[in-house]
């Protein structure tokens, strides 16, 4: 990480593991006011690599609900509506940060956790390996 | 959120804004050991809606580096390599959580922030609005 000079106006931390444990304000600031997230809401259906969204719920995690994309087909949908196996539908995955309650069930103590989620699907040309 | 009973083995919080401010262990636990994230590393190039990845860096944020996808074309790439404008390349966006240093430059005090990132692109059938 980047070394940041200690500022006298900062909250103090007596934690012996500092800087591993920090204070986090859960009053979320949303920077997406200018963007309409609904804009992409029907891409899952209109895509040539359409996907379904599955609800993944875990009360020990923040956010507790995460939506996981699952590609509908192994191939991609052509203009005539048929599935073409010359192309492949694949999930686009992203590593995201979540907060995991630790110890379990504790309301005010968390650990950062990285999880891999499938956000949607895209249509790719397969890598073809022919038998000699 | 879900109400979770107070557990006597939990760290105590004297913060008057509790439960808005919590302790977070930054020693990240990575749950993705079973998945090979490299699997999707070339999708950006092989997709019919290829994208470029732009580095977004902010030292006041954790993680400080986020990669943003930008679709290369307005249309989608056909099997012959030409761009088909009857179809549209669109970004798949996801809201993710990041930690924002607050007050600024403080190493041990953060606020949760939601930001919208483009993870990759997918090829969709356009919505055609005919003139009456």
């Amino acid at each position: 990480g980047i070394a940041i000079p200690r500022n006298s106006g900062c909250p103090n931390s007596e934690d012996k593991n500092f800087p591993r444990t920090v204070m986090v304000n859960l009053n979320i600031h949303n920077r997406n006011t200018s963007t309409n997230p609904k804009r992409s809401s029907d891409y899952y259906n209109r895509s040539t690599s359409p996907w379904n969204l599955h609800r993944n719920e875990d009360p020990e995690r923040y956010p507790s609900v995460i939506w996981e994309a699952k590609c509908r087909h192994l191939g991609c949908v052509k203009a005539d509506g048929n599935v073409d196996y010359h192309m492949n539908s694949v999930p686009i995955q992203q590593e995201i940060l979540v907060l995991r309650r630790e110890p379990r069930h504790c309301p005010n103590s968390f650990r950062l956790e990285k999880i891999l989620v499938s956000v949607g699907c895209t249509c790719v040309t397969p890598i073809v390996h022919h038998v000699a | 959120g879900i109400a979770i009973p107070r557990n006597s083995g939990c760290p105590n919080s004297e913060d008057k804004n509790f439960p808005r401010t919590v302790m977070v262990n930054l020693n990240i636990h990575n749950r993705n050991t079973s998945t090979n994230p490299k699997r999707s590393s070339d999708y950006y190039n092989r997709s019919t809606s290829p994208w470029n990845l732009h580095r977004n860096e902010d030292p006041e944020r954790y993680p400080s580096v986020i990669w943003e996808a930008k679709c290369r074309h307005l249309g989608c790439v056909k099997a012959d390599g030409n761009v088909d404008y009857h179809m549209n390349s669109v970004p798949i966006q996801q809201e993710i959580l990041v930690l924002r240093r607050e007050p600024r430059h403080c190493p041990n005090s953060f606020r949760l922030e939601k930001i919208l990132v483009s993870v990759g692109c997918t090829c969709v059938t356009p919505i055609v609005h005919h003139v009456a």
Epitope: N52, R72, L74, Y85, N88, S89, P91, P126, I127, H129 | -
Partner: antibody, heavy 120, light 111 residues
């Protein structure tokens, strides 16, 4: 338990159309499965013909593409095969089958099959 | 179209013996998502095929553990550790990574 049952004429004349119906019980055809038609020629050779998925998307064997159509009637929980311009080469046992279409993409339940002979 | 080649065509075995059937595809069966969609079926005389193994090595529900699948890329094997009378019939490999295709079948019969 899921059951799939084929029905249709056992004899079709050359150049005519073959129409078969598959009736599904114990499973909605709009849940996460693909509903396949597969045929077996005399001598055991199996050929995948095509499917219609839970969302109504179809996929066909490229060798049959110009002659085949698979449709469905969700209210009756049935799906259908139409094969046009048949020849004696289309004589086979025709199976309808369910494919687990959410993860394994394998046919997990087959009907008993219906024998179709193409002859004048 | 992917061609699936099974060997042998016929496999005479004694009950209790191990049996091994090979299946080779004309192209790699690894999908871009990393999975390999290679499956095995058994068709007993007068019956429709039944799923035994899916995605190379996973036994379908109710399939005895004497059946096992292995392989990768283009070469796959089905093994039966101790053949029983109820195992006799025609075994087919199949792939669904590309347009689905089947192997020609291997007839398991008593020696």
């Amino acid at each position: 338990d899921v059951q799939v049952q084929e029905s249709g004429p056992g004899l079709v004349k050359p150049s005519q159309s073959l129409s078969l119906t598959c009736t599904v019980t114990g499973n909605s055809i709009t849940s996460y499965y693909a509903w396949n038609w597969i045929r077996q020629f005399p001598g055991n050779k199996l050929e995948w013909m095509g499917y219609i998925t839970y969302s109504g998307t179809t996929s066909y064997n490229p060798s049959l593409k110009s002659r085949i159509s698979i449709t469905r009637d969700t209210s009756k929980n049935q799906f259908f095969l139409q094969l046009n311009s048949v020849t004696t080469e289309d004589t086979a046992t025709y199976y309808c089958a369910r494919e687990e279409y959410d993860d394994i993409y394998a046919v997990d339940y087959w009907g008993q099959g219906t024998s179709v002979t193409v002859s004048s | 179209i992917i061609v699936m080649t099974q060997t042998p065509l016929s496999l005479p075995v004694s009950l209790g013996d191990q049996a091994s059937i090979s299946c080779r595809s004309s192209q790699s069966l690894v999908h871009s998502n990393g999975n390999t969609y290679l499956h095995w079926y058994l068709q007993k005389p007068g019956q429709s095929p039944k799923l035994l193994i899916y995605k190379v090595y996973n036994r379908f529900s109710g399939v005895p553990d004497r059946f096992s699948g292995s392989g990768s890329g283009t070469d796959f094997t089905l093994k039966i550790s101790r053949v029983e009378a109820e195992d006799l019939g025609v075994y087919f490999c199949s792939q669904s990574t590309h347009f689905p295709t089947f192997g020609g079948g291997t007839k398991l019969e008593i020696k």
